[in-house]
């Protein structure tokens, strides 16, 4: 019998390389059975995760899974960093793995750097 616990399917150490100035949707895949849980996004600041209150979010429902989406319209250099989604379900808090956004500032970088270049050319990134 399939578990009816809420599950958040963000892969461990997942990351996205994205460009500032363009939109991006960060998805938190959520699996639940009957009632959809209350899900929030937060951004890691050291050891604490700061809840994102004034940000646009939405749900996308698919047949076997739902996605809680954090909208970046557009991505800003300040959006660089690690994010986590959390679900409140039957008084339990379920936290996802963190997912990291690497933001390239297209106004100061003429080309999008590869992951290898990110380490050697840190001025292209807000890290």
């Amino acid at each position: 019998k399939e578990s009816c616990d809420v599950q958040l399917y963000i892969k461990r150490q997942s990351e996205h390389s994205i460009l500032a100035g363009d939109p991006f949707e960060l998805e938190c895949p959520v699996k639940y059975c009957a009632n959809r849980p209350h899900v929030t996004w937060c951004k890691l600041n050291g050891t604490t995760c700061v809840k994102l209150e004034d940000r646009q979010t939405s749900w996308k429902e698919e047949k076997n899974i739902s996605f809680f989406i954090l909208h970046f319209e557009p991505v800003l250099p300040n959006d660089n960093g690690s994010y986590r989604c959390s679900a409140n379900f039957q008084s339990n808090l379920i936290e996802s793995h963190s997912t990291t956004l690497y933001v390239t500032d297209v106004k100061s970088a003429s080309e999008r750097p590869s992951k290898d270049e990110m380490a050697s050319r840190p001025w292209l990134l807000y890290r």
Partner: antibody
Framework: QVQLKESGPGLVAPSQSLSITCTVS????????VHWVRQSPGKGLEWLGV???????SYNPAPMSRLSISKDNSKSQVFLKMNSLQTDDTAMYYC??????????????WGQGTSVTVSS | QIVLSQSPAILSASPGEKVTMTCRAS?????MHWYQQKPGSSPKPWIY???NLASGVPARFSGSGSGTSYSLTISRMEAEDAATYYC?????????FGGGTKLEIK
């Protein structure tokens, strides 16, 4: 220097469609977004939508079904098409450049606007 | 959608007078922009992200606020400040403008 210039038909008959072209100079459409904003006496300033640098679009959900924004990067032009115009679509239509700073996004350079009147 | 309510709708001030206009949002926003518009002209960026003056804007202007309440203040009114000022939020689509405050010189 940064410039945006709108060109439109001026007069449109009710139920017809509107096409406006925004020609930009001083910046690249692959780096900056271009927005469409209209201003009418009845509704004030209303954001219609944006063409993002990478080619995606975002629209105001209210008039979204009637709107289409496209661009030609090589010609530095952004296009607004709006279908099924009614008299309350009479307005000044502006194209506006969008720019980001480290932690905010704003519309900085505005075109002079093109006046559109919907009337038979 | 987030509704921005500006008050007062019309404001009349004498030269040298301190002027404050407000913009209230129906939901919390991260920051507020302000634009100035004079008759026959396009809106001009005036204050970015709550408190950053746009290029060329005199230092007598300032902006403040957070959450749902924001304001634009002129420390000493001058004749060239007569215009309509619009607040604008970029937190949630549709990205809305306030109805404007028309500032007149006495």
């Amino acid at each position: 220097q940064v410039q945006l210039k709108e060109s439109g038909p001026g007069l449109v008959a009710p139920s017809q469609s509107l096409s406006i072209t925004c020609t930009v100079s001083g910046f690249s459409l692959t780096t900056y977004g271009v927005h469409w904003v209209r201003q009418s006496p009845g509704k004030g300033l209303e954001w219609l939508g944006v063409m993002w640098p990478g080619g995606r679009t975002s629209y105001n959900p209210a008039p979204m079904s009637r709107l289409s924004i496209s661009k030609d990067n090589s010609k530095s032009q952004v296009f607004l098409k709006m279908n099924s115009l009614q008299t309350d679509d009479t307005a000044m239509y502006y194209c506006v450049r969008g720019d980001y700073e480290y932690d905010y996004y704003a519309m900085d350079y505005w075109g002079q606007g093109t006046s559109v009147t919907v009337s038979s | 959608q987030i509704v921005l309510s500006q008050s007062p709708a019309i404001l009349s001030a004498s030269p040298g007078e301190k002027v404050t206009m407000t913009c209230r949002a129906s939901s919390s926003v991260s920051y507020m922009h302000w634009y100035q518009q004079k008759p026959g002209s396009s809106p001009k960026p005036w204050i970015y992200a709550t408190s950053n003056l746009a290029s060329g804007v005199p230092a007598r202007f300032s902006g403040s606020g957070s959450g749902t309440s924001y304001s634009l203040t002129i420390s000493r009114m001058e004749a060239e400040d007569a215009a309509t000022y619009y607040c604008h939020q970029w937190s949630s689509n549709p990205y809305t403008f306030g109805g404007g405050t028309k500032l007149e010189i006495k």
